[in-house]
């Protein structure tokens, strides 16, 4: 706290508020009889800038010229030092350094809508640190002038509150902004414009869309605009897209026909307006209209595949599978699939509509030539049917692809490769690669996946519905006319040693040897494709290494004979399973003693 200046005065010239870079003159003078008591020439006046001495003088007054002060406030204090006493405060001064306003730049004015008011913005330039008064002046025809002031440190916008009208759209108006503070003033360059230059139309409103006869090819967009609008631009895009389609239209009078919309697609539409071909600015975009285009009948054809399963001497089970049409092919909500099954020689046909599934299973006689046709229907019609002749897909041995292999290819992908069949490879019309999770029971409910490959391809990357640590049964079919050949292999995308070994459920004696039966390892514990089982045995209470027998893994096999056991010796037996990654832990242990005679 600086005491009021009882002992002396500080005067400041030219002012307490000065321009950056200028000099200030500070004078400190003692009032009469306020110096040191005995000898006035012992008076030592000291000037401090904050806490640092910058000048001193013996006598009744001190004069100091100060330069180089920074922006903002600097505190000066004048003190008196007498012999054998502390310094006494005389008086203080704060000097504030600011800058004169820079020339306001980029003055631009706008009137939002035909009924709006003229408002201008500008760039202030460097912060002055001082109260700066901005005066905005607008002059028009017939010596009309308008003026508006704003008294704020950070002013860069003013609204005149007046409305320019289109009576004389080519009349010139000139705007200028002047900034004044206690350190100086500056004016912008004048900005000259006409009504058409500065009126920015309001965005269009009341946007609607109509589809004549519920057809996507007869679509009209309607909207409302201010009266003087000449130009519009429309932009639209499917709701799931980031790219806009853009259309410019002149004298649209609030409507425009759109010809390239896709059916059954949600679109977002926006419109902007402008008063003149090359003057003025575009309005903001309107609020979005979202609308779904009508359905059209599906295009494209379903990808259909099938499986045959022998039931008995007279019957077979046919399972049909098909893939959904893509959105662009479905062109609407698929309501049902129509499946037609026909015996080609007798002409008998049955048709069924399937909803909610992409598969169908039926039982047909093993005799006769059968064909199926499958199509997809939406509210507007059906796709062209996909026709397939039901044949024995693996009958032609010479058409079987050779050297089929399946290798892991990164996360959840399997690369299947093969060689063309021995029979004339050029006869192959296409390959089909089919895969499904391996289930020991051959469960037909397990989903089937397939992809088609061109006849010159000898590999396919399968990634759809592939999970880690699951074994897949993979078949490669070569199709030629009404014949087919196939080869199969097991494959996985990722594997590790099985989590458990097989569970031995029975050991039986047969003619001096034993038959071991086991339960399959649960699929979720196999951790990939099993390559082998191992059966281990050793004499009970013996420390010798166990003997083992390795059996190649076959899906349906769950028993195996062993004939190298000695009669009347008690053995301990157990099993493990192996994938390419390693061997499982032991399964359960069983003891067995062969009763028969030794050979």
């Amino acid at each position: 706290k600086i005491d009021a200046c009882k002992r002396g005065d500080v005067t400041v010239k030219p002012s307490h508020v000065i321009l950056l870079g200028s000099t200030v003159n500070i004078t400190c003078s003692l009032k009469p009889r306020q110096g040191c008591f005995h000898y006035s020439r012992r008076n030592k006046l000291i000037l401090y800038k904050f806490d640092r001495r910058i000048n001193f003088h013996h006598g009744h007054s001190l004069n100091s010229q100060v330069t180089g002060l920074p922006l903002g406030t600097t505190l000066f204090v004048c003190k008196l030092a007498c012999i054998n006493s502390d310094e006494i405060q005389i008086c203080g001064a704060e000097i504030f350094v600011g800058v004169a306003p820079e020339q306001p730049q980029n003055l631009s004015c706008i009137q939002k809508g035909e009924q709006g008011t003229v408002a201008c913005t500008w760039e202030r330039g460097r912060d002055t640190h001082l109260y700066t008064e901005y005066t905005l002046q607008l002059s028009g025809p017939k010596n009309l002038t308008w003026q508006k002031q704003c008294k704020d440190i950070y002013c860069d916008y003013l609204d005149f509150g007046i409305n320019l009208t289109p009576e004389s759209p080519e009349s010139n108006f000139t705007a200028k902004v002047t900034a004044v503070n206690s350190l100086g003033s500056s004016s912008s360059l004048p900005s000259t414009f006409t009504f058409l230059d500065i009126v920015r139309p309001l965005p269009p409103w009341d946007i609607r869309i109509k589809f004549q006869k519920a057809s996507v090819s007869r679509c009209t967009l309607y909207w409302r605009d201010e009266g003087l609008v000449l130009l519009n631009r429309l932009r639209y895009r499917p709701s799931n897209s980031r790219l806009w389609n853009m259309v410019n239209v002149t004298k649209a009078k609030g409507r425009h026909d759109l010809l390239d919309l896709k059916p059954f697609t949600e679109y977002e539409f926006q419109i902007s307006s402008k008063l003149h071909l090359y003057k003025g600015s575009w309005s903001d975009w309107s609020e979005s209209l979202r609308a779904q285009t009508p359905e059209e009948e599906p295009t494209g054809m379903l990808d259909v595949w099938y499986m045959k399963r022998h039931i008995d001497y007279s019957r077979q089970q046919i399972s049909l599978f098909w893939k959904n049409l893509s959105v662009s092919e479905a062109r609407g909500k698929i309501l049902h699939y129509q499946v037609t099954l026909q015996e080609l020689t007798g002409g008998k046909a049955m048709t069924q509509n399937i909803t909610g599934h992409t598969s169908w299973t039926t039982v047909i006689p093993r005799t006769g030539n059968w064909a199926v046709a499958v199509s997809a229907a939406n509210s507007k019609g059906s796709s062209l049917p996909t026709r397939i002749n039901i044949m024995n897909l693996c009958e032609a041995g010479l058409l079987a692809p050779r050297q089929v292999s399946a290798n892991s290819e990164g996360m959840d992908n399997i690369l299947v490769t093969w060689q063309p069949p021995r029979k004339d490879p050029s006869a192959v019309q296409e390959y089909v690669v089919e895969w499904r999770e391996l289930h020991p029971g051959g469960d037909t409910q397990v989903p089937l996946n397939w992809l088609r490959s061109r006849p010159y391809n000898v590999s396919a990357l399968i990634s759809e519905n592939i999970k880690s640590y699951i074994c897949y049964e993979i078949r490669v079919y070569a199709l030629s006319g009404d014949q087919g050949g196939c080869s199969s292999i097991l494959g996985n995308s990722k594997h590790k040693a099985p989590l458990s070994g097989p569970h031995i459920n029975a050991i039986t004696e047969e003619k001096g040897s034993i038959l071991i039966s086991w339960n399959s390892i649960p699929v979720q514990e196999q951790m990939g494709c099993l390559l082998h089982y191992r059966i281990y045995w050793k004499e009970r209470d013996s420390n010798s290494q166990p003997q083992l027998c390795e059996i190649p893994y076959r899906v349906s096999q769950n028993s195996h004979p062993i004939n190298s056991l000695q009669p009347r010796v008690t053995y301990v037996l157990w099993m493990t399973a192996l994938t390419a990654a390693g061997e499982s832990s032991h399964g359960n242990e069983r003891e067995f003693c062969l009763q028969g005679k030794a050979n």
Epitope: D9, V10, H16, G92, A93, Y131
Partner: nanobody, 119 residues
Framework: QVQLQESGGGLVQAGGSLVLSCAAS????????MSWYRQAPGKQRELVAE???????TYADSVEGRFTISRDNAKNIVDLQMNSLKPEDTAVYYC?????????????WGRGTQLTVSS
């Protein structure tokens, strides 16, 4: 922002004396500088005298030795004691307060009081 009310103007004979007073109300905290300006008809507004919150002063050359500015920080009042008045001192006298506003100064002005010095 601060509101300023000037008082004390009027008609005075040349050579006479008068005191102008200015009272600050509202958010009068941190008033850095209180000043008197004047504007004669047809002329620019000019600084007469100013006083900082620490008591330092500045005077225009034309009034130095005749006018004295003083300030009561507690009451937020600034007085301008005018002696040896001359006809050229005739003007509207405005009170101004500069307040800190962040690292900037924000100014407030009074509406002014008329001083007429007759010869």
């Amino acid at each position: 922002q601060v509101q300023l009310q000037e008082s004390g103007g009027g008609l005075v004979q040349a050579g006479g004396s008068l005191v102008l007073s200015c009272a600050a109300s509202g958010s009068a905290a941190l008033i850095f500088l209180m000043s008197w300006y004047r504007q004669a008809p047809g002329k620019q507004r000019e600084l007469v005298a100013e006083v900082s919150r620490y008591g330092s002063t500045t005077y225009a050359d034309s009034v130095e030795g005749r006018f004295t500015i003083s300030r009561d920080n507690a009451k937020n009042i600034v007085d301008l004691q005018m002696n040896s008045l001359k006809p050229e001192d005739t003007a509207v006298y405005y009170c101004k307060a500069d307040q800190y506003y962040g690292d900037s100064l924000r100014s407030s002005w009074g509406r002014g009081t008329q001083l007429t010095v007759s010869s």
